[in-house]
């Protein structure tokens, strides 16, 4: 019933008043985007806990993978299940819990010297839940299930531009951080200030590509140089 | 399991101080900005202030301005909201949420009552 | 600050029937990455508010079908296909894409 799952899918709502920027008073600024999912809840035991509804397995926790909840069901709606544990049947390594991953359809454990390189140092989430180590933080710990996949995709939450795919960089987003494409030529780009010359922007751009430098676009229109974009241009 | 548990709350008397904390698991918190939101008895909620991934940038509503601090530790997995001159009107149910997808806590409630 | 105004503020709906409520905002909530930043909660005597409804139309996992959103720009509407009994409380709506996170004034749904 509505009831039953309302009771267990807690979210709170939100409204009033805001003060300026920090170092902008009283502007208006856009906050993060984004909708109230449930997290823990007084309401809520082990028992009735909410699925997470989700996309893809990096929207999932380091223990759970993302899957229709029924057999053959509905592939539209999808929520984040319960790692399967060594000697289980998979389809993919993500539906392993961690330490093991997916050998001919079945979960066995990890060997620790398998898998090196870039999948220990990548952190990538989606918009969601997590494989990170508890200080959030990449280390060369045990290896997560969920650290056989892909790096970050555009709109995937990040922690440094390494943890994002190829032609994406990780960049502010409202109040966090999360994989941006990296610019074409002739894209607007900000001229990035140095450190110290603090300046709060809540969407930042991600920098010109590969061979490519953000420079005042050349415009004898623009009056002053203030006033000039930046594009990104050839070297 | 990804979630938010806020704790700190309690009675207190009105020009006091609390700290609330909320600790985070199963993300990646220091990617993450965070807010907290409060709910007074029989009232909407309130958003009470955000705080940057990095902690670098803090926004206050005005009801609370110069008051309250939003901090965080990433190091911890932990976000906080250290009330001073705690005001009757304060007493309310407080929660911490994450923004893009954005998760919320169970809540803890502060009693500002002489 | 974004307002949010909701229409009608209280319903009275026969069980099994649908109900419609509005909602408009002061500006457009379609941010630049393509998404609208609206939402619908309900929440009940003594509860916290329940969410229903994410980005104008995204129903939360297991939210029954008979609840839908619509809209765009600055009009949206949340619709109720057949009320049932346990529907009952205060719908609102709410915008994230400024702060501060703006909603209407709630709408109370009761049963005849």
């Known amino acids: 019933t509505l009831n039953s799952v309302l009771n267990s899918n807690a979210i709170k709502n939100l409204p009033p008043p805001l003060g300026g920027a920090a170092g902008h008073p009283g502007s208006a600024v856009s906050a993060a985007p984004g909708i109230l999912y449930p997290g823990g809840n007084k309401y809520q035991t082990i028992d009735n806990y909410q699925p997470y509804p989700c996309a893809e397995d990096e929207e999932c926790g380091t223990d759970e993978y993302c899957a229709s909840p029924t057999r053959g069901g509905d592939a539209g709606v999808q929520i984040c299940l319960a790692c399967r544990k060594r000697r289980k049947r998979c389809m993919r390594h993500a539906m392993c819990c961690p330490g093991n991953y997916c050998k001919n359809g079945i979960c066995v454990s990890s060997d620790q010297n398998h898998f090196r390189g870039e999948i220990e140092e990548t952190i990538t989430e989606s918009f969601g839940n997590d494989h990170s180590t508890l200080d959030g933080y990449s280390r060369r710990t045990t290896l997560s299930s969920k650290m056989y996949h892909t790096k970050g995709q555009e709109g995937s939450v990040c922690l440094r531009s390494s943890d994002c795919a190829s032609g994406l960089c990780c960049d502010r987003h409202f109040w966090s951080k999360i994989c941006k494409p990296v610019l074409k030529e002739g894209q607007v780009c900000t001229k990035h200030r140095r450190k110290g010359s603090h300046g709060l922007e809540i969407f930042q751009r991600c920098y010109c590509g590969e061979g490519l430098s953000c420079r005042i676009q050349k415009d004898h229109h623009q009056a002053s140089n203030s006033s000039r974009l930046h594009t990104c241009q050839r070297h | 399991q990804v979630q938010l548990v806020e704790s700190g709350g309690g009675v207190v008397q009105p020009g006091r101080s609390l700290r609330l904390s909320c600790a985070a698991s199963?993300?990646?918190?220091?990617?993450?900005?965070m807010h907290w939101v409060r709910q007074a008895p029989g009232k909407g909620l309130e958003w009470v202030a955000v705080?940057?991934?990095?902690?670098?940038?803090?926004y206050y509503a005005d009801s609370v301005k110069g008051r309250f601090t939003i901090s965080r530790d990433n190091s911890k997995n932990t976000l906080y909201l250290q009330m001073n001159s705690l005001r009757t009107e304060d007493t309310a149910e407080y929660y911490c949420?994450?923004?893009?997808?954005?998760?919320w806590g169970q809540g803890t409630l502060v009693t500002v009552s002489s | 600050d974004i307002v949010m105004t909701q229409t009608p503020l209280s319903l009275s709906v026969t069980p099994r029937q649908p109900a419609s409520i509005s909602c408009k905002s002061s500006?457009?909530?379609?941010?630049?990455?393509?998404?609208?930043?609206l939402y619908w909660y309900l929440q009940k005597p003594g509860q916290p508010p329940q969410f229903l409804i994410y980005?104008?139309?995204n129903r939360f996992s297991g939210v029954p079908d008979r609840f839908s959103g619509s809209g765009s720009g600055t009009d949206f509407t949340l619709k109720i296909s057949r009320v049932e009994a346990e529907d009952v409380g205060v719908y609102y709506c709410?915008?994230?894409?400024?702060?501060?996170?703006?909603f209407g004034q709630g709408t109370k749904v009761e049963i005849k």
């Open positions: 500006q457009s909530l379609l941010h630049s990455d393509g998404k609208t930043y």
């Open positions: 199963g993300f990646t918190f220091s990617s993450y900005g």
């Open positions: 949420a994450r923004e893009l997808r954005v998760l």
């Open positions: 980005e104008v139309s």
């Open positions: 705080i940057s991934y990095d902690g670098g940038d803090q």
């Open positions: 709410m915008q994230s894409i400024q702060l501060p996170w703006t």
